[in-house]
Interface confidence: low
């Protein structure tokens, strides 16, 4: 079971990211699903290896003092959202605005039925160029 | 089937990092081979999960406008290359250079004698101690 | 055999960081332990997918120079310590600090006892906030 | 160390409500959820529902979603859970109990409150 | 909702002796690395304590004599040797899906 999905650009205001199974995506079997272009949700209960990465392009004087943060979120059938990793990168002084990149990753118990999500503090800095932001699962 | 190879300094121009078995690397067999020093080669079709990762340092004043990526890229047999990965990182304004660091990860299909490797837009800025740089895959 | 646990805010002056299974954590059995609150120590010999995150905030006027250096140590029975991955980043100008993550992860091979660890420049920059740092390892 | 502080006994009519307290203390409040659990006189026990201290979130056994009604303040590190529409059923010991990290095993427990609903 | 039924209800054991108490859900609670599965003491007058979590992970502070076994659908939790002390109920409690339920209790006398 794995899989192995492409940022989309969203008009949604959403701060959740949105993916597709477009380029060179992986989608192994039926016992993992990309739901609403927003979540990986798998059939099976175990052990799953889950990263995301994000490229962004931010400028410190034209964002919030806040920096970006990146978090990979769990939806357990019946149970509160709950974030199992964050990495956070300060803004760039470079204009118009200075790319960097973030990578997650961590061993996870997923339940079945439990979805896996990528949110971020502003959508709308979020790389979209080929191979720059993606997201994805293997079941140990 | 799992490779962890070491980056290695070269001087030749080419944007292709090198590599090299040497220090704590991994060749678990001959399955997967370190070919040139600059691609891994799989003999198996599957799923794999392909990382690198690579530190670099650099100057804002030094460097060209444009920040520093790398990428992991996929050259299957009869095929063009692709990019499966990007990170992107804007040039540090310490001098004389600023380290920074870029990890990438993902699981993609590999056919037989598929090879994988990895560029960047200035070797020259590389980081080669003891760590800093390594290229590996492992066969779900 | 897997396990991934979350980083712990320590008085000790120690550059090691601590670690705790608290929050979403996973240790998938006995054959993988987690020692003194900061190493996993294995039983079984074999190739495993190690990695760590660490997110640090730090300002560039009140750190050293050097860059923040966050490094993945083994520790074999019988053996000096060494250094498998380490990644670098510089301070942030940003007052009154920066936040910034670091990704490490690598595949290598552990003899029954080996211990692995996680050590940075300056542990009281560390984050410790809900899914900021990890470490984790995975039998292939 | 960790500590649940609950509400002093009520007796209470019939028909009535009640709101029931547990002061935390000894953790970060807002990262853990707390539950509520119901003991009967004699009896076993039964768990009501939880709060998520952070955002408000509820989720409830079926059997209470329109008996109980939990709360928090953050600002105080309190939870609430108000009993409407009371009966001689509702009579029971009620604890507040904070569970294990993420794994729902309840580590620490309140002394229990206890209602009495009698005319 | 996942049933959880204890057996046997009520218990007597000489002390130093063994006291073995079985919880059986109505369906698994158990994954591939954990079984959800957790055990309480209850003495009268105070709130339950939490003994054993996932099944066989001895709580910190809580004496060896306690112990925990099982898997899937059959949970075991031993006393031994028994003291005067643990004259109590004793519960089963599972965290697999919501809601959580308990097991009616078993209710140890010491002889």
């Known amino acids: 079971i794995a899989a192995h999905v492409i940022s989309e650009a969203s008009s949604k205001t959403t701060s959740v990211l949105q993916w597709a199974e477009k380029g060179y995506y992986t989608m192994s079997n039926n016992l993992v699903t990309l739901e609403n272009g927003k979540q990986l949700t798998v059939k099976r209960q175990g052990l799953y290896y889950i990263y995301a990465q994000v490229t962004f392009c931010s400028n410190r004087e034209a964002s919030s003092q806040a920096p970006f943060i990146a978090s990979l979120c769990l939806k357990s059938p019946g149970r509160f959202e709950r974030i199992l990793l964050r990495a956070a990168n300060t803004h760039s002084s470079a204009k118009p605005c200075g790319q960097q990149s973030i990578h997650l990753g961590g061993v996870f118990e997923l339940q079945p039925g439990a979805s896996v999500f990528v949110n971020v503090t502003d959508p709308s800095q979020v790389s979209h160029g080929t191979g720059f932001t993606s997201f994805g699962l293997l079941k140990l | 089937i799992a490779a962890h190879v070491i980056s290695e300094a070269s001087s030749k121009t080419t944007s292709v990092l090198q590599w090299a078995e040497k220090g704590y690397y991994t060749m678990s067999n001959n399955l997967v081979t370190l070919e040139n020093g600059k691609q891994l080669t799989v003999k198996r079709q599957g799923l794999y999960y392909i990382y690198a990762q690579v530190t670099f340092c650099s100057n804002r004043e030094a460097s060209s406008q444009a920040p520093f990526i790398a990428s992991l890229c996929l050259k299957s047999p009869g095929r063009f290359e692709r990019i499966l990965l990007r990170a992107a990182n804007t040039h540090s304004s310490a001098k004389p250079c600023g380290q920074q660091s870029i990890h990438l990860g993902g699981v993609f299909e590999l056919q037989p004698g598929a090879s994988v490797f990895v560029n960047v837009t200035d070797p020259s800025q590389v980081s080669h101690g003891t760590g800093f740089t390594s290229f590996g895959l492992l066969k779900l | 055999i897997a396990a991934h646990v979350i980083s712990e805010a320590s008085s000790k002056t120690t550059s090691v960081l601590q670690w705790a299974e608290k929050g979403y954590y996973t240790m998938s059995n006995n054959l993988v332990t987690l020692e003194n609150g900061k190493q996993l120590t294995v039983k079984r010999q074999g190739l495993y997918y190690i990695y760590a995150q660490v997110t640090f905030c730090s300002n560039r006027e009140a750190s050293s120079q050097a860059p923040f250096i966050a490094s993945l140590c083994l520790k074999s029975p019988g053996r000096f310590e060494r250094i498998l991955l380490r990644a670098a980043n510089t301070h942030s100008s940003a007052k009154p600090c920066g936040q910034q993550s670091i990704h490490l992860g690598g595949v290598f091979e552990l003899q029954p006892g080996a211990s692995v660890f996680v050590n940075v420049t300056d542990p009281s920059q560390v984050s410790h906030g809900t899914g900021f740092t990890s470490f984790g390892l995975l039998k292939l | 160390q960790v500590q649940l502080q609950q509400s002093g006994a009520e007796l209470v009519k019939p028909g009535a409500s009640v709101k029931l307290s547990c002061k935390a203390s000894?953790?970060?409040?807002?990262?853990?959820?707390m539950f509520w659990v119901k003991q009967r006189p004699g009896q076993g026990l039964e768990w009501i529902g939880e709060?998520?201290?952070?955002?408000?979130?509820?989720n409830f056994n079926e059997e209470f979603k329109s008996k109980a009604t939990l709360t928090v303040d953050k600002s105080s590190s309190t939870a609430y859970m108000q009993l409407s529409s009371l009966t001689s059923e509702d009579s029971a010991v009620y604890y507040c109990?904070?569970?294990?990290?993420?794994?729902?095993?309840?580590?620490?427990w309140g002394p229990g409150t206890s209602v009495t609903v009698s005319s | 909702d996942i049933v959880l039924t204890q057996s046997p209800a009520s218990l007597a054991v000489s002390l130093g002796q063994r006291a073995t108490i079985s919880c059986r859900a109505s369906q698994s609670v158990s994954s591939s690395r954990y079984s959800y599965m957790h055990w309480y003491q209850q003495k009268p007058g105070q709130p339950p304590k939490l003994l054993i979590k996932y099944a066989s992970s001895l709580e910190s502070g809580v004496p060896a004599r306690f112990s925990g076994s099982g898997s899937g659908t059959d949970f075991t939790l031993n006393i031994h040797p028994v003291e005067g002390e643990d004259t109590a109920t004793y519960y089963c409690?599972?965290?697999?899906?919501?809601?959580?339920?308990f097991g009616g209790g078993t209710k140890l006398e010491i002889k």
């Open positions: 409690q599972h965290s697999w899906e919501l809601p959580w339920t």
């Open positions: 000894g953790y970060t409040f807002t990262r853990y959820y």
């Open positions: 709060i998520n201290p952070t955002n408000g979130d509820t």
């Open positions: 109990t904070r569970p294990l990290g993420s794994r729902d095993a309840m580590d620490y």
